[in-house]
């Protein structure tokens, strides 16, 4: 089932079907018994019931108002009521470019990597019994595909790809031609594959301990393939023997990048640990990242304003 | 863009030495620290350990895994840092790359294979 029309502002081409489904329409054995009414108001305007005999071009099915077609005039706020429910759209109906296959305000924007897969399908679930046939066109210049029902692009991306690409169904509705368009801006990029290598959490961390006693600090990142993460840590006063950098942990994500973790173990905490930064960095050629801990006797929290302790 | 060169590695028995140099294409005269990264076979991805570090102040903080067995060191007239690597035990096995430390990564080199195995 389609779903509802969430968003409450909509915008939309003069000329094409269009229509709103309210949200409450799972409800389906109240909206049996249950009265339901549909408003518009517009300008001067409050609060108007709408109904087929409003006009010729407006259709009321359960949960849906249909416009045959949508035009300038029916720019306006419309409303759905059921015993305590209402739901509200701000509809702005825009006019078409008459000297294009599509309006420019319209239109979806998509950035595809070269050599990345690369897809479009024309596809719309609501109005499929209805349509008769769809177009696919690049630049307003049909394309020739093999399925004149679901017209379909899948291919690896190449730069010549860049483009508008426009659905466009035609349909019949009381024996009136129709016709809906999506036009896809699709630029092609160059592979953005490495992103900026990230560490997560607080950039700057005081943590709470007792001397004598040990500490793991924990260094967290996003990162790609090639990048590392490390500890940074008595550069000027020699190595401490208490303290250990444990192995890092690396767990790919889905999207292909790295989520690593590098633990900092400080044993036998003394009072050389104290006050003192230790700095997990990501790097990559990219640039760094770096986060900061600072060990803090408990005794002393007081000193330092609550948000900027981790436990 | 700089280049780095690794060399020296190889196949050497358990408690054996090897001596590894890296040199760069540009100074590093200016690099405050540079460090060896090694890649071991079964790591995740690329994943790289920081096992030894020096700053432009000679100053040396190594992985608990290698201290006391390997000495960083650099020579920034020559554009070069070394790794001097005793006592290898068969966990050091692993390609060993140089590059900065403490700020952005130059561009990886090829790495030089260390393998130890009796």
């Known amino acids: 089932a389609e779903s509802c029309t969430s968003r409450p502002h909509i915008t939309v081409v003069e000329g094409e079907p269009f229509y709103l489904k309210h949200c409450s329409c799972s409800l389906a054995h109240e909206i049996e018994t249950t009265t339901k009414s549909w408003y518009k108001s517009s300008g001067s305007q409050e609060h108007v019931e709408l109904n087929p005999r409003s006009s010729s071009r407006i259709a009321l099915h359960d949960c849906v108002l249909e416009f045959w077609p949508v035009e300038l005039n029916d720019t306006g706020s419309y409303f759905f009521q059921m015993k305590n429910y209402t739901q509200k759209w701000k509809l702005n109906v825009i006019r078409r470019n008459k000297h294009s296959c599509f309006t420019e305000r319209q239109v979806t924007s998509k950035i595809v990597e070269v050599k990345k897969f690369f897809q479009i399908t024309c596809e719309n679930s609501y109005y499929q019994t209805l349509v008769n046939s769809t177009s696919l066109y690049k630049n307003c210049k049909k394309l020739l595909l093999e399925n004149n029902k679901n017209p379909t692009i899948k291919k690896n991306a190449e730069f010549e790809d860049q483009g508008y690409y426009s659905c466009v169904h035609f349909l019949h509705h009381n024996g009136k031609l129709f016709n809906i368009t999506k036009t896809f801006n699709i630029t092609i990029v160059e592979d953005r594959s490495n992103i900026v290598p990230v560490l997560l959490g607080p950039k700057l961390n005081h943590v709470a301990v007792e001397l004598g006693k040990n500490v793991r600090l924990n260094c967290s990142a996003l990162l790609n393939e090639e990048d590392v993460i490390y500890w940074m840590f008595g550069e000027e006063n020699g190595s401490d023997p208490n303290i250990h950098e444990e192995k890092e942990m690396r767990i790919m994500t889905p999207e292909g990048k790295w989520h690593a973790s590098k633990v900092l173990r400080i044993e036998n905490i003394g009072e050389s640990n104290l006050n003192v930064l230790y700095n997990c960095t990501v790097a990559s050629t990219g640039g760094t990242d770096t986060k900061s801990f600072i060990l803090v006797r408990k005794a002393d929290m007081a000193d330092i304003p609550g948000h900027v302790f981790t436990r | 863009e700089v280049q780095l060169v690794e060399s020296g590695g190889g196949l050497v028995q358990p408690g054996g030495s090897l001596r590894l140099s890296c040199v760069a294409s540009?100074?590093?005269?200016?690099?405050?620290?540079m460090g060896w990264y090694r890649q071991a076979p079964q790591a995740p991805g690329k994943q790289r350990e920081l096992v030894a570090r020096i700053t432009s102040g000679g100053s040396t903080i190594y992985a608990t895994s290698v201290k006391g067995r390997f000495t960083i060191s650099r020579d920034n007239a020559k554009n070069t840092v070394y790794l001097q690597m005793d006592n290898l035990k068969p966990d050091d096995t692993a390609v060993y790359y140089c590059?900065?430390?403490?700020?952005?990564?130059?561009?990886w080199g090829q790495g030089t294979q260390v393998t130890v195995s009796s």
């Open positions: 540009g100074s590093i005269s200016s690099i405050n620290g």
């Open positions: 590059n900065i430390y403490g700020g952005a990564l130059w561009p």
